[in-house]
């Protein structure tokens, strides 16, 4: 009876279990009743990082110097290239696809520490009573407007991203 499931590092095809190709190799042809799976090493600047049945290897990532990127770790047939940023610059994401001089803090966050040559911007959430409605690399959270000191009342509560809205007091006639 043909198998319905295969062992680890195997795959099911044409009612039979074939070996997957090892990392660094791609599939050329599936196994048959008489032949093993045929695999071929990935070419220069290509990789596959898992046991697989891929017919094409993936291209190594290109660390584009025009985006401030350089190679941190050269790729192999089993691993992708790892990019990093030029000295003094910071990756915009874990994948490091582009670089910024320093990150900015989003609305709802204020700058706790301005970036230096060695450290990126440090952001902090605006606590209750403070807000930031801009993306900035230098602005701290600002305190909500005090309506009382203007002889006004709060018409709309503030948030971490918006100031309070003040309005006139309702006066009894």
């Amino acid at each position: 009876e043909p198998p319905t499931a295969c062992r680890e590092k195997q795959y099911l095809i044409n009612s039979q279990c074939c070996s997957l190709c090892q990392p660094g190799q791609k599939l050329v042809s599936d196994c048959t009743e008489f032949t093993e799976t045929e695999c071929l090493p990935c070419g220069e600047s290509e990789f596959l990082d898992t046991w697989n049945r891929e017919t094409h290897c993936h291209q190594h990532k290109y660390c584009d110097p025009n985006l401030g990127l350089r190679v941190q770790q050269k790729g192999t047939s089993e691993t992708d290239t790892i990019c990093t940023c030029e000295e003094g610059w910071h990756c915009t994401s874990e994948a490091c696809e582009s670089c910024v001089l320093h990150r900015s803090c989003s609305p709802g966050f204020g700058v706790k520490q301005i970036a230096t040559g060695v450290s990126d911007t440090i952001c902090e959430p605006c606590p209750v009573g403070f807000f930031s409605n801009v993306s900035s690399a230098f602005e701290k959270c600002h305190p909500w407007t005090s309506c009382e000191t203007k002889d006004l009342v709060v018409q709309q509560a503030g948030t971490n991203k918006t100031d309070v809205v003040c309005g006139p007091q309702d006066r009894l006639r």
């Epitope: 985006l67 940023c85 030029e86 915009t92 001089l101 990150r103 801009v134 993306s135 690399a137």
Partner: nanobody, 116 residues
Framework: EVQLLESGGGLVQPGGSLRLSCAAS???????EMWWVRQAPGKGLERVS?????????YYADSVKGRFTISRDNSKNTLYLQMNSLRAEDTAVYYC?????????WGQGTLVTVSS
């Protein structure tokens, strides 16, 4: 395409003044926080000064506080840096940059040399 064109650099004696300009195009200038950043020969980038989009709030590095003034004219899409009481240690290439400070969004810079 974002373009930032710095000008106004030159050779000046210690104690002298210069006014740098940065002409911006390719983006809505009035919506962006802007920075002046400098790089002295053989040194890393130093953040000098920043200004919010409306021009109402500013930041200055301790090394330039009281001597430099950042300003902007949103009607002319231009950023300025007025530099007074210049010192030898202010010698650097000065760049203007916009949020989010990506590597490709920089001008060529303008060289300021402070020397007697």
């Amino acid at each position: 395409e974002v373009q930032l064109l710095e000008s106004g650099g030159g050779l000046v004696q210690p104690g002298g003044s210069l006014r740098l300009s940065c002409a911006a195009s390719g983006f809505t200038f009035r919506d962006y926080e802007m920075w002046w950043v400098r790089q002295a020969p053989g040194k890393g980038l130093e953040r000098v000064s920043a200004i919010n989009p409306q021009g109402t709030r500013t930041y200055y590095a301790d090394s330039v506080k009281g001597r430099f003034t950042i300003s902007r004219d949103n009607s002319k899409n231009t950023l300025y840096l007025q530099m007074n009481s210049l010192r030898a240690e202010d010698t650097a290439v000065y760049y203007c940059a916009k949020l989010p400070f990506t590597f490709e969004d920089w001008g060529q810079g303008t060289l300021v040399t402070v020397s007697s």
